[in-house]
């Protein structure tokens, strides 16, 4: 069991923006508003980010560190999915994505990581101390869930400093101690602030976002040394319980996709979707829902009137090619 504060690795500044410090000016508040406490498993990482532009808007990013075939990802808030949590989104690798307010956009980032943007206004909007959980169902690894949240004091000045250390796999958890990483981050942050102080105030420009190729295992937490905590989740008591959502599967059994028409199963392949992420061949246990049942010993799902899906053209294994032997 591990507990870690996870912040993203800083990207090197873009050369063109270095002079005006535009990139760093944008990165700094974003980084300061990023803090995540993940507990429960070394196999799943969760990152909760409060947007610097909209302080009531959240981005949740989750990833699975196993190498098996992911069959479902469930994002919930207010606690783990099966223990009082309310489902925000369900992402199925072949049958698409289902989301519920206040979830604004759920999508696959890589074949083993997802992101979810939460709407920031209204009665059901999240608040700083809400706990978000991600559950990955994979074979042969099983179901793995981890939870994260912004601390109640999500004031930019109080957030943990970033760690510029490279992304680490969970297995290498003991290499860097938390103190060392935080110290390094503090020094780096002070260095940035100092440089910022000695420069003329830059003119604000509209941020230009360059689409980044999805990286497998991106944003994996650089973990703290293994804590001997035998607590399944670090659930922070939240004073702002989410409003009741229109969940089609309130008991955690995602039956909404069990009755989908088969034509809804394949997601359209976006232009050059996943071209930058080579999809590894999977073993015989992979079950791509239409056409490859024999390899996984799977039966086709029942057809019938299904729910409307929001297919994600950037699906991780949309129309996967021939399967290799693991």
């Amino acid at each position: 069991m591990r507990t870690e504060a996870q912040v993203p690795a800083l990207q090197p500044p873009e050369p063109g923006l270095e002079g005006a410090m535009g990139h760093r000016t944008l990165v700094l508040p974003w980084v300061l508003l990023t803090l995540c406490v993940t507990a429960g498993t070394p196999e799943v990482w969760v990152q909760v980010r409060m947007e610097a532009t909209e302080l009531s808007s959240f981005t949740i990013r989750c990833g699975f560190l196993g190498s098996g075939s992911i069959s479902l990802v469930t994002v919930s808030w207010g606690g783990p999915n099966g223990a009082g949590g309310t489902t925000l989104a369900v992402l199925h690798p072949e049958r698409g994505i289902r989301q519920w307010a206040p979830a604004r956009q759920a999508r696959w980032e890589t074949q083993s990581s997802i992101s979810l943007i939460l709407e920031g206004s209204g009665a059901s909007s999240p608040c700083a101390n809400t706990t978000f959980c991600c559950k990955f169902a994979s074979f042969p690894e099983g179901s793995w869930e981890a939870c994260g949240s912004l601390p109640p004091s999500s004031d930019p000045g109080l957030s943990a400093p970033p760690t510029p250390a490279p992304i680490l796999r969970a297995d290498l958890a003991g290499i860097l101690g938390v103190s060392g990483v935080l110290l390094f981050g503090c020094v780096y942050l002070l260095h940035l602030l100092r440089r910022h102080k000695h420069r003329p105030a830059p003119r604000l420009q509209p941020s230009r976002t360059s689409p980044q190729a999805p990286r497998a295992r991106a944003w994996a937490p650089s973990q703290a040394s293994q804590a001997a905590l035998h607590v399944p989740y670090a659930t922070i008591n939240t004073s702002c319980r989410p409003a009741t959502l229109d969940t089609a599967h309130p008991h955690g059994g995602p039956s909404w996709w069990a009755s989908l028409p088969t034509h809804a199963a394949h997601r359209p392949q976006g232009p050059a979707a996943w071209a930058s992420t080579p999809i590894p061949a999977r073993g015989s246990f992979v079950s791509v829902e239409n056409g490859l049942y024999a390899q996984a010993g799977e039966r086709p799902p029942h057809t019938g009137p299904g729910l409307t899906l929001f297919p994600d053209p950037r699906g991780p294994r949309a129309m996967e090619g021939p399967l290799g032997v693991r």
């Epitope: 196999e43 098996g68 042969p140 099983g142 869930e145 297995d171 599967h249 955690g252």
Partner: antibody, heavy 119, light 108 residues
């Protein structure tokens, strides 16, 4: 309290068929993956098959693929294992198991049902 | 297929004695997907230690688990009569899911 109760075992001739059932209670059945694990007379444990909570994902051991079919009825809280073309090597106690998040596939076990394949 | 080899196959220990049994995997297994089960005669197996070192609910603290890669072990710091049972190791890092043949622990 999680309860898994297997039934349907018995004596069957080689080449014959048998359908095992597992009645579950004490938890939200539709929210968990279920498996069949068997224990041979030599006391070896062998994984047979697994079915995801929704029921559309199924996984089999190589030895059983094509002969066995795992299925579930979420409305009735029942898990099934349809076995055909049975061999003497299939003689075992068959256990129904339930998974748990962050704990693996076989967190909870039923009491088992004995299947004997013999002429 | 990951083959799990448990040793010894049978062992006996006196009350209060420290007991260690091992499980060796034919290829590397992530510690998260490695577990131990306890089975007593006439009963079903029970999850005993999950993810290498975490004790399942109701397991006495005299039990501990450790290991990584291809080598794992279960230790009882002080043998008690109720610990006499067969212990199986299990991995679900790779398909098919496999179990060791078991270590039968008897009370001397």
């Amino acid at each position: 309290e999680v309860q898994l109760v297997e039934s349907g075992g018995g004596l069957v001739k080689p080449g014959g068929s048998l359908k095992l059932s597992c009645a579950a209670s004490g938890f939200t059945f539709s929210g968990y993956a279920l498996s069949w694990v068997r224990q041979t007379p030599e006391k070896r444990l062998e994984w047979v098959a697994t079915i995801r909570d929704g029921g559309s994902y199924t996984y089999y051991s190589d030895n059983e693929k094509g002969r066995f079919t795992i299925s579930r009825d979420n409305a009735k809280n029942n898990l099934y294992l349809q076995m055909s073309h049975l061999k003497s090597e299939d003689t075992a106690i068959y256990y129904c198991t339930r998974d748990q998040v962050n704990r693996g596939w076989f967190t909870y076990w039923g009491q088992g049902t004995l299947v004997t394949v013999s002429a | 297929q990951v083959i799990l080899t448990q040793s010894p196959a049978i062992m006996s220990a006196s009350l209060g004695e420290r007991v260690t049994m091992t499980c060796s995997a034919s290829s590397s297994v992530s510690s998260s997907y490695f577990h131990w089960f306890q089975q007593k005669p006439g009963s079903s197996p029970k999850l005993w230690i999950y993810s290498t070192s975490n004790l399942a609910s109701g397991v006495p603290p005299r039990f501990s688990g450790s290991g990584s890669g291809t080598s794992y072990s279960l230790t009882i710091s002080s043998m008690e009569a109720e610990d006499a049972a067969t212990y199986y190791c299990h991995q679900h890092h790779r398909s098919p899911l496999t179990f060791g043949a078991g270590t039968k622990l008897e009370l001397k």
